[in-house]
Amino acid sequence: PRNDTCPELPEIPNGWKSPSQPELVHGTVVTYQCYPGYQVVGSSVLMCQWDLTWSEDLPSCQRVTSCHDPGDVEHSRRLISSPKFPVGATVQYICDQGFVLMGSSILTCHDRQAGSPKWSDRAPKCLLEQLKPCHGLSAPENGARSPEKQLHPAGATIHFSCAPGYVLKGQASIKCVPGHPSHWSDPPPICRAASLDGFYNSRSLDVAKAPAASSTLDAAH
């Protein structure tokens, strides 16, 4: 045997190496892979080192006997029959209240002649059962809203306006955003007096009813 090369690397059961006929000089990298249905145990990558030994022990190929974790599904909880998903294991998905399952609620891990075990179906989805409406918002003081409904369908927009002499602070239009539950895109706006005139005009009754001192205020204004 040559004393300037690493030892020959054998083939492994249920797998192969690449390159299949490597140069055995220092720096050579050999990768082992397994046939479908088998997984590498140990290091799949070996390197011929300066001291002409391989960097790792020879790996082996072990039969895959379980399915991968099918994952969580948003808006659901799942019931698992076995924690490591061996062949025969089941995962049941149960959608949260307000959601409905599309697809298969129960997945089963099946063995296959060739290849790794596989789930009976893809993970399902949990969809909104319905688009709930948004409850009507009251009109701002000294303002109005349109339309004046108690319930607004998801996607609908309501518009706000203010009485003459008042200006809108906030969003003039807000949308009923679909969701669980549906909700308004912004808080309702308020109507503020456009000037002090507006402020006092809106309170003229208060002024009339107020004690004498307030008339000085009014006169000063």
Epitope: E74, H75, C95, F99, V100, L101, M102, G103, S104, S105, I106, K125, C126, L127, L128, E129, Q130, L131, A154, G155, A156, K175, V177, P178, G179, H180
Partner: antibody
């Protein structure tokens, strides 16, 4: 209100790829628990579901057409795009997009008629 | 795939008279959650389909109460208590319980 509008070519040649766009308003394509679907209807015939795309970008296809279809979305533009390869005269149909939740199509676009002819 | 079969194909009705459309599924469309996702759509001439009934018997928002749905398992019916001229079009049943979702072939309602 929730509205959808389809756009795309009126005429495509056999073997070409069809690209259709659905622009939605009144809801976001990222609204959790919702999806948008494409459905088609050949002239004088029944409706056929083609594909769904969900809020989380998961995609489901009609198995009989899966190899020819690709659905995608651009949430920022509120658009869902369907491409269908290797078009044939039998694919002549009105193509609709619709919201999908509650296991039904609640809101539909007005549809776009696509004719496949050389 | 589940096949949805509708009868009749064509239904001529006098305004004010009742109408009934039948839909049969090739297998049970009861969902794993116990509900049945059987819907009815109406496609008026030159328009896109509109949802009338969902989950067998629930009217969608804005649908007049002359429309009603019933049935279970594999047999379902859409009834119109008094047909109006605006009800003309093609009615489709649809199942969403199982993937892929499938439509019936349609029933054309016309005014006599």
């Amino acid at each position: 209100q929730v509205t959808l509008k389809e756009s795309g070519p009126v005429l495509v040649k056999p073997t070409e790829t069809l690209t259709l766009t659905c622009t939605v308003s009144g809801f976001s394509l990222s609204t959790s628990g919702m999806g948008v679907s494409w459905i088609r209807q050949p002239p004088g015939k029944a409706l056929e579901w083609l594909a769904h795309i969900f809020w989380d970008d998961d995609k489901w296809y009609n198995p009989s057409l899966k190899s020819r279809l690709t659905i995608s979305k651009d949430t920022s533009k509120s658009q869902v795009v369907l491409t269908m390869t290797n078009m044939d005269p039998v694919d002549t149909a009105t193509y609709y997009c619709a919201t999908f939740y509650g296991l039904y199509f609640a809101y539909w676009g007005q549809g776009t008629l696509v004719t496949v002819s050389s | 795939d589940i096949v949805m079969t509708q009868t009749p194909l064509s239904l001529p009705v006098t305004p004010g008279e009742p109408a009934s459309i039948s839909c049969r599924s090739s297998q049970s469309i009861v969902h794993s959650n116990g509900n049945t996702y059987l819907e009815w759509y109406l496609q008026k001439p030159g328009q896109s389909p509109q949802l009338l009934i969902y989950k067998v018997s629930n009217r969608f928002s804005g649908v007049p109460d002359r429309f009603s749905g019933s049935g279970s398992g594999t047999d379902f019916t859409l009834k119109i208590s008094r047909v109006e001229a605006e009800d003309v079009g093609v009615y489709y049943c649809f199942q969403g319980s199982h993937v892929p979702p499938t439509f019936g072939g349609g029933t054309k309602l016309e005014i006599k």
